[in-house]
């Protein structure tokens, strides 16, 4: 509340997050031409990355391109990329949509289609849809512990969201436990009016807002956080602006003295913790 | 503009970036004592890292130290590091400039020079200049899409820099398209009065400032971002304060049951997206 | 100091850090059933990670689980996890404390204890204490160079903490050299009234506050940073809220056609650089 007589000061904040949970992933795996059901367990070291402070990322889906090697190959035949003769292919050309540099030759991609040959990590990534339902859809049941230390330097006041009286086996609930700082990911989405199962396919960005409205006067002291949640990415975004949230990373290795990589396109939820508020004192 | 009757509130911001582009890298590669011209393609998974929010990094140059193993070896003979007898070498000493711990012995580095033996990742990193021109100098033509979601919680107002009417194939231009949020890296440097080709050698830090000056009164509503660019690292910095921008990281592997690593000293541009501004309402 | 006639503006800040130092680590290593003393050198690429801006992390301790593979195994017999018959084990159950999914069978963990069999990365991580003293306790002598560029856009004023007159071989000292921006990690802890050796075991979060109180009026211009230090994690935190600072990450590889990983639980100090302050001008 606005107390005009008070000296207001913005909050200085530090955040530490800890995600817990394991996911069971079942997918079709092809080895030596044989496709069989693959089953694996993902724990925190597999689906999240050591990130700093105000953000954490949980992988909910992925597409793998295994055993890529630097060589020449036909580019992926996405819309408008097919060719019938070398005239259509321009040596040295880098199409922003493509993953390589054209050699100038038009070569067979498969029995029916031809595309421009490129120098690239080959075979080039197939532009296939993210798996639906999402492979790590069970991430909905993961929990995150959020620790937030705040400081008003001008008032020489420091506090944190976790008090000694709190119970480490609680789960945040807007009504029943609004001060608990352990959040179930599915609940965050529900509070924000979003469908976790749906967002998990393409990924997205979710904001966890922590609002500190602190009255630091001794006679009416109050300084506790209020949590709220809102989706930060635009779910109605045009394809050309890359909807959802994903990034590519690679695992490199050597086989028969040739450098290879497995390319992973990781879709997931990036959670941004947005801390704001003021401390007021007479 | 300052409207003194308005209640001003600082912006709460979330940023998402997506870099696009491929680079063709040609460099001398030595294998089995034979030096030949190596040619490779770098895509986003090779030159950028999954980073959070307000920063992204594009590698523009690198120096590799391949096949390092934990053992004893002569340290690199940089200025003042040579020795003629064991007296010059102090067992257990860690020179901050060196990469290992001295054993106390003075040993031959090559046919003409001797240096103190160290326990380290060997052979120790050669202190050679970053390649000039930069290996990924073509990163100048990469583009970055910046998505920025902003919120004024006190005014319960949210918006973003990308509007539904925008065209996903645009490129930012200060005059012709100042609202487009797809930026060519070379253009960012040009706007900031900097030379990309030059900075790419040693690396640097570039600020992309997004200024929101929002009038939220319904009768004169305005809330769109203004982009500006400025270099954040000090190009005139003394050697001792580590000019440019680089960091080292390692790829670990096993060979004949011995743990080895390839050390990469990555030079590049870190782009910091600095979002600021206020929302005012009567 | 508060000059009421001035127009105040919050600082816009960009930070770049560079850690220096090497650590000698001695630990027991078991190979082929034989335990012997292992000795290794850690340099920046081994103990720190390429992180963005306002945070950097220094690993001070670790626990490794080597050669894990996705299979079935008995879960770790932590308190309350033992079983005597299959009735105690529930097929498909994921205990939040466990690292896998139960198969429903109760199997021998060792000669004396039985636990529920799980599908997991096996053998499952042993829940053992972090080594004491910390393996990289010598990180106390590492140094960090902090470069801070600040901007008051409304006043069109930019400066940085490192001036051309500064000496790159200085070390920060509150009294003798309060403007030097090279900090010994142990000194930061001492200034904050904390014991580095103790915190290094479990990890922690340390704040480096940079306060800019800038008077930008030409007749009494002053704009230099003031550094202060305070611990941000709660050292008295209950076990259930995960005291200290650690995260798990994995190194993946293939052996005998099976994907394996080495899981590293990294304990360390996350340093948060908190820049705040205002620029005032008539």
């Amino acid at each position: 509340s606005d107390k005009l007589y008070q000296r207001k000061e913005p909050v200085i904040s530090s955040v530490h997050t800890k995600v817990k949970g394991i996911a069971e992933v079942t997918e079709n795996v092809t080895e030596g031409g044989v496709t069989k059901l693959g089953h694996s367990i993902f724990d925190t070291a597999d689906y999240t990355f050591p990130l700093q402070g105000n953000s954490f990322f949980v992988m909910t889906n992925y597409v793998k391109s295994e055993g890529q090697v630097q060589t020449l190959c036909p580019e992926y035949p996405r819309r408008g990329a097919q060719c019938s003769s070398d005239r259509r292919c321009k040596k040295g050309w880098m199409d922003p949509q493509s993953k390589g540099i054209q050699t100038g030759r038009c070569v067979p991609y498969d029995k029916t289609r031809k595309t421009c040959e490129v120098s690239a990590w080959c075979p080039t990534e197939e532009e296939k849809e993210a798996p639906r339902p999402a492979l790590l859809r069970s991430a909905e049941n993961f929990t995150v512990l959020i620790k937030n230390n705040i400081h008003f330097p001008g008032h020489n006041y420091t506090t944190r969201n976790i008090l000694p009286t709190m119970n480490g086996s609680c789960t945040f609930h807007k009504t029943w436990d609004p001060q608990c700082s352990i959040f179930r990911l599915g609940d965050i989405f529900q509070e924000a009016g979003e469908n976790f199962t749906e967002v998990a396919v393409q990924g997205g960005i979710m904001g966890i807002e922590i609002y500190w409205d602190c009255n630091l006067d001794s006679w009416s002291h109050h300084c506790r956080p209020r949590y709220s949640f809102r989706r930060l990415d635009d779910k109605n975004m045009d394809e050309s602006f890359v909807p959802g949230y994903n990034f590519r990373y690679a695992k490199y290795y050597k086989e028969n003295n040739v450098e290879k990589r497995t390319l992973i396109k990781a879709f997931g939820i990036r959670f941004d913790i947005l801390v704001f508020g003021t401390g007021g004192k007479f | 503009s300052d409207k003194l009757y308005q209640r001003k509130e600082p912006v709460i911001s979330s940023v998402h970036t997506k870099v696009k582009g491929i680079a063709e890298v040609t460099e001398n590669v030595t294998e089995g004592g034979v030096t030949k011209l190596g040619h490779s393609i770098f895509d986003t998974a090779d030159y950028t890292f999954p980073l959070q929010g307000n920063s992204f990094f594009v590698m523009t140059n690198y120096v590799k130290s391949e096949g390092q193993v934990q053992t004893l070896c002569p340290e690199y003979p940089r200025r003042g590091a040579q020795c003629s007898s064991d007296r010059r070498c102090k067992k257990g000493w860690m020179d901050p400039q060196s990469k290992g711990i001295q054993t106390g012995r003075c040993v031959p580095y090559d046919k003409t020079r001797k240096t103190c033996e160290v326990s380290a990742w060997c052979p120790t990193e050669e202190e050679k200049e970053a390649p000039r021109p930069a290996l990924l100098r073509s990163a100048e033509n990469f583009t970055v899409l910046i998505k920025n979601n902003i919120h004024f919680p006190g005014h319960n107002y949210t918006t973003r820099n990308i509007l539904p009417t925008m065209n996903g194939s645009c490129t930012f231009h200060k005059t012709w398209d100042p609202q487009c949020s797809i930026f060519r890296l070379g253009d960012i440097f040009q706007e900031a009065g900097e030379n990309f080709t030059e900075v790419a050698v040693q690396g640097g830090i570039m600020g992309i400032e997004i200024y929101w000056d929002c009038n939220l009164d319904s009768w004169s509503h305005h809330c769109r971002p203004r982009y500006s660019f400025r270099r954040l690292d000090d190009k005139n910095m003394d050697e001792s304060f580590v000019p440019g921008y680089n960091f080292r990281y390692a790829k670990y592997y096993k060979e004949n049951n011995v743990e080895k690593r390839t050390l990469i000293k990555a030079f590049g541009i870190r782009f910091d997206i600095l979002v600021f501004g206020t929302g005012g309402k009567f | 100091s508060d000059k009421l006639y001035q127009r105040k503006e919050p600082v816009i800040s960009s930070v770049h850090t560079k850690v220096k130092g090497i650590a000698e680590v001695t630990e027991n290593v078991t190979e082929g059933g034989v335990t012997k003393l292992g000795h290794s050198i850690f340099d920046t690429a081994d103990y720190t990670f390429p992180l963005q801006g306002n945070s950097f992390f220094v690993m001070t301790n670790y626990v490794k689980s080597e050669g894990q593979v996705q299979t079935l195994c008995p879960e770790y017999p932590r308190r309350g996890a033992q079983c005597s018959s299959d009735r105690r084990c529930k097929k498909g159950w994921m205990d939040p404390q466990s690292k896998g999914i139960q198969t429903g069978r109760c199997v021998p963990y060792d000669k004396t204890r039985k636990t529920c069999e799980v599908s997991a990365w096996c053998p499952t991580e042993e829940e053992k204490e972090a080594p004491r003293p910390a393996l990289l306790r010598s990180a106390e002598n590492f140094t960090v160079l902090i470069k801070n560029n600040i901007h008051f856009p409304g006043h069109n004023y930019t400066t940085r903490n490192i001036l051309p007159t500064m000496n790159g071989s200085c070390t920060f000292h509150k009294t003798w050299d309060p403007q030097c921006s090279i900090f010994r990690l142990g000194d930061i802890f001492q200034e904050a009234g904390e014991n580095f050796t103790e915190v290094a075991v479990q990890g922690g979060i340390m704040g480096i506050e940079i306060y800019w109180d800038c008077n930008l009026d030409s007749w009494s211009h002053h704009c230099r940073p003031r550094y202060s230090f305070r611990r941000l994690d709660d050292k008295n935190m209950d076990e259930s809220f995960v005291p200290g600072y650690n995260f798990r990450y994995a190194k993946y590889y293939k052996e005998n056609n099976v994907e394996k990983r080495t899981l590293i639980k990294a304990f360390g100090i996350r340093f948060d650089i908190l820049v705040f302050g205002t620029g005032g001008k008539f």
Epitope: E24, T26, K36, L37, H39 | - | G67, Q68, V69, Q70, T71, L72, C73, K91, G92, I101, Q102, T103, G104, R105, E117, S119, C122, P123, E255, N256, V258, K260
Partner: nanobody, 120 residues
């Protein structure tokens, strides 16, 4: 139907060597622990050696240093290389494996056994 099929047993002189192999066949999801047990005349069945899917090995004290267990994860086969054989190694050697038929459906399987006889 999942089966474990052993081979490689036989008669050998003391100090000699043999290599046993055992292949899992049929339709299943994953082979986990594989092992060799033996049962000498008038004795109980005892563990000789086992090997996890991650190639961690464990040996009975009586064979440590003489026998080597290994596996091939492509062929779902386990091997036992037996060197420096002694008369007391005479037994029927049984292959054992924990095999998941489907996800979270482990079963323990035994081979029929193969006779190893060491003459002095």
């Amino acid at each position: 139907e999942v089966q474990l099929v052993e081979s490689g047993g036989g008669l050998v002189q003391a100090g000699g060597s043999l290599r046993l192999s055992c292949a899992a066949s049929g339709s299943f999801f994953r082979v986990n622990v594989m092992a060799w047990y033996r049962q000498g005349p008038g004795k109980q069945r005892e563990l000789v050696a086992d090997i996890t899917r991650g190639d961690r090995t464990n040996y009975a004290d009586s064979v440590n240093g003489r026998f080597t267990i290994s596996r091939d994860n492509v062929r779902n086969t386990v091997y036992l290389q037996m060197n420096g054989l002694k008369p007391e190694d005479t037994a029927v050697y049984y292959c054992y494996a924990t095999i998941e038929l489907g996800v979270l459906e482990p079963r323990d399987y035994w081979g029929q056994g193969t006779q190893v006889t060491v003459s002095s």
